[in-house]
Every structure is written in C-alpha cells, then in structure tokens.
C-alpha cells in the first residue's frame, strides 16, 4: 500500500480486519489510531533478515510507505495475533494503551505533553542532561532487558523511559485531547494514538544466532538423547550386577 | 536510533514567512511520522503540524491555512512553511519524529529546536 491516507475509511477496515486487529468504527478521529495499529503489525510481522548495508543507506519515506514490492516480507495473519490482541482485553469501546519503557530522546527541558495522552516522559534539569544520549546499547542488550523494565515501575529524572498505562475512549476526539491526540512514544509513536505496547506481538527468534565455528565447543556441547539412555541402561545393568554378585557373596561364604 | 537535525528559522516580520526543515538519518525505516512542535516562554510545547509516513497530515487549529508541512521522499526531510506569520507565532520549533522496532517498541526523537521570531 503506497498510502494509508488514501484508502476509503471501508478500505482501511478491510485491512484491519485482514490483519485479524480488532477495531471500532472506522472514522476521522480515530483513523490515525487504525494506521498506527497497522504500521506497528506490518513492523512485527516483517521478517527478521535485516536490509542490505547498501539498501539500508537509500531507505526514504517511499520506501517505507510501499509494501506492495514487499509482500514477501509479511507472514500472513495468524491466529494468534488475533489472540494476542485479544488476550490485552481490546474491545470496540476502548484500548489499553501500555506504553512499556517509553523513551523519549532529547526531549526539550520543561516541556508539556506532545500527542496528548502521552505525557512528557522526561524532564531534563539541566542543559548537559538535555543534550545528553542514550545509545540503544545501553537501554536494550537483548529481548530479555526489555521483559526486566516492564517489571521496574518507575525511573529517575533522567531516566528516559517510563510506564504508561490508561484507558482512553477511541472515540475521543483530537481537539479534546490538547491538539496531542496521537502518542508518539509508547516506547510511542511519531503519529500516532493507538495501544502501543512495546513488545507483547514480539516474538523471540526461535534458533540462537550462529556462532564463530569452534566458539562454545566444550562446554555447550550436550549428550544426545539416545546417549543418555544407553548411559542409564549401562548404569541400570551394573547395578544389577553388583546387586546380584552381592547376594551370591552373601549365599556363598566360600 | 534516529537523528533529527533542523534548519531554518530566524527573524521575520509579521505577514511574512519563513521554511524550516528537518532531516532524519539513522534508523529512519523504523520512522512512522515526523511533525513540528514549538514551545513559547512561559508556555507549554504544543503541536504545530506532522506528516505520518502513509501521507496523512494533521494541523494545529491555530496554523491552519498558514502553514503547510510537506516531505522529500528521496531526503526523509519534512518542511514546514510557515506564512503569514504572527507576533505569537514565536517559538522554538521542534522537530519530532516517532518510530516503531520490535525490540523497543514506540520511542519518540526530538531535535535540538530552531528559534522563530516574529518581530516588527
């Protein structure tokens, strides 16, 4: 789909439904919501396989805005991810937004809210603390640090990220919202005022990345199934024997 | 990450304009919308325009008509605009980008804000 702003309000709820995302009526104020949902589902359901370094230096908004070259790139729905979002209790009336580990870079100092029901996740108190960065190696090593902020209920001042979770009407309206309808972090988004958790479609890569060929030879290795069972069969069998040389010995003295 | 540099800005005369512009590098495929927001002395940041990658635009009530926010495909640079400007469109204009991973989920970027003054 070169563009979203294009489709019929029919259109684009065709596609949730396509997408198995749970959805309300379809109309101006909650439109930006429904093409959040879907740029967030097409984001996880792209697979794993990162871009060419050569491809990844030319990416621009066109690309990010065609998916019909891309349709390779997508899983098709499955089942679970309509129970996924079922399991977050969404319903027509009302979505939780679970805005796991917000982070907000170089956010100005002092500054109100930015889409509304997002509020200011950090405020600076000083300029070096403005300017200060946050490299995503130091927030995130792996899927497992991110499990662990979920768990840590609040962060300092200077702390990037926090947890956000509230109920908000669909149906809200923008202007009620102080012109901030749309969240843009949720960990949030750059336009957008739909549930954003930060991780609960994520899945985790099934196979461990490969290693350097000898790395882990030792200690990683493991005795396969069909081993251990001849070991306890061999294990069994001596204990037999010794059990029945005890008992002749005990029979026979001499 | 993604990295906002703003351009632009400056000194103008009410009734006259001004462009700014905001160009995104780094992980920019994971960009979802970028939009203009400024904050006034005294006055909490406020929404002036953004641009969502699928197209859709969305204004401030008090901008509308007078500014426009446009995007370079080929740059992933978005423009705002700015005519007819008023004394109280005086500010500094920050540009915000929202993007989506799968391992951090939404995180929000914000550049470093560009002065706008409108002055006799």
């Known amino acids: 789909m070169d563009n979203y702003a294009d489709l019929s309000d029919t259109e684009l709820t065709t596609l949730l439904r396509r997408y198995n995302i749970p959805h309300g009526p379809v109309v101006g104020s909650t439109r930006r919501l429904y093409e959040k949902k879907i740029f967030e589902y097409e984001t996880q359901r792209r697979r794993l396989s990162p871009p060419s370094s050569s491809a990844a230096s030319s990416y621009s908004f066109s690309d990010l805005n065609s998916t019909r070259g891309d349709a390779d790139m997508y899983d098709l729905p499955k089942k679970e991810d309509a129970l996924l979002y079922q399991s977050k209790g969404y319903n027509d009336d009302y979505y939780e937004e679970s805005y796991f580990t917000t982070r907000t870079y170089g956010e100005p100092e002092s500054a109100g809210p930015s889409r509304a029901v997002r509020q200011s996740v950090t405020s600076f108190p000083d300029a070096d603390a403005f300017h200060h960065q946050v490299h995503d190696d130091d927030l995130l090593s792996s899927s497992e640090e991110e499990c662990k902020d979920r768990e840590r209920p609040m962060y300092g001042r200077d702390s990037a990220y926090q947890s956000i979770t509230h109920y908000r009407p669909v149906s809200a309206s923008r202007s009620s919202l102080d012109l901030s309808y749309y969240p843009t972090s949720s960990s949030t988004s750059f336009m957008s005022s739909s549930s954003s958790s930060s991780s609960w479609l994520t899945r985790r890569a099934i196979r461990p990345e490969n290693r350097a060929p000898g790395a882990g030879l030792g200690q990683d290795r493991q005795v396969p199934l069909w081993g251990q069972l001849l070991l306890f069969l061999v294990f069994v069998i001596v204990l037999f024997f010794i059990y029945h040389f005890m008992q002749a010995e005990e029979g026979n003295p001499f | 990450q993604v990295q906002l540099v703003e351009s632009g800005g400056g000194l103008a005369q009410p009734g006259g304009s001004l462009s700014l512009s905001c160009a995104a590098s780094?992980?920019?495929?994971?960009?979802?919308?970028m939009g203009w927001y400024r904050q006034a002395p005294g006055k909490k940041r406020e929404l002036v325009a953004d641009?969502?990658?699928?197209?859709?635009?969305n204004y401030a009530d008090s901008v509308k008509g007078r500014f426009t926010i446009s995007r370079d495909n080929a740059k992933t640079t978005i423009y705002l605009q700015m005519n007819s400007l008023k004394p109280e469109d005086t500010a500094v204009y920050y540009c915000?980008?929202?993007?989506?991973?799968?391992?951090?989920?939404?995180?929000?970027?914000w550049g470093q804000g560009t002065q706008v003054t409108v002055s006799t």
């Open positions: 641009i969502t990658n699928y197209g859709s635009t």
């Open positions: 780094g992980d920019i495929f994971s960009i979802y919308a």
């Open positions: 915000n980008a929202d993007s989506y991973s799968k391992l951090r989920g939404w995180v929000v970027y």
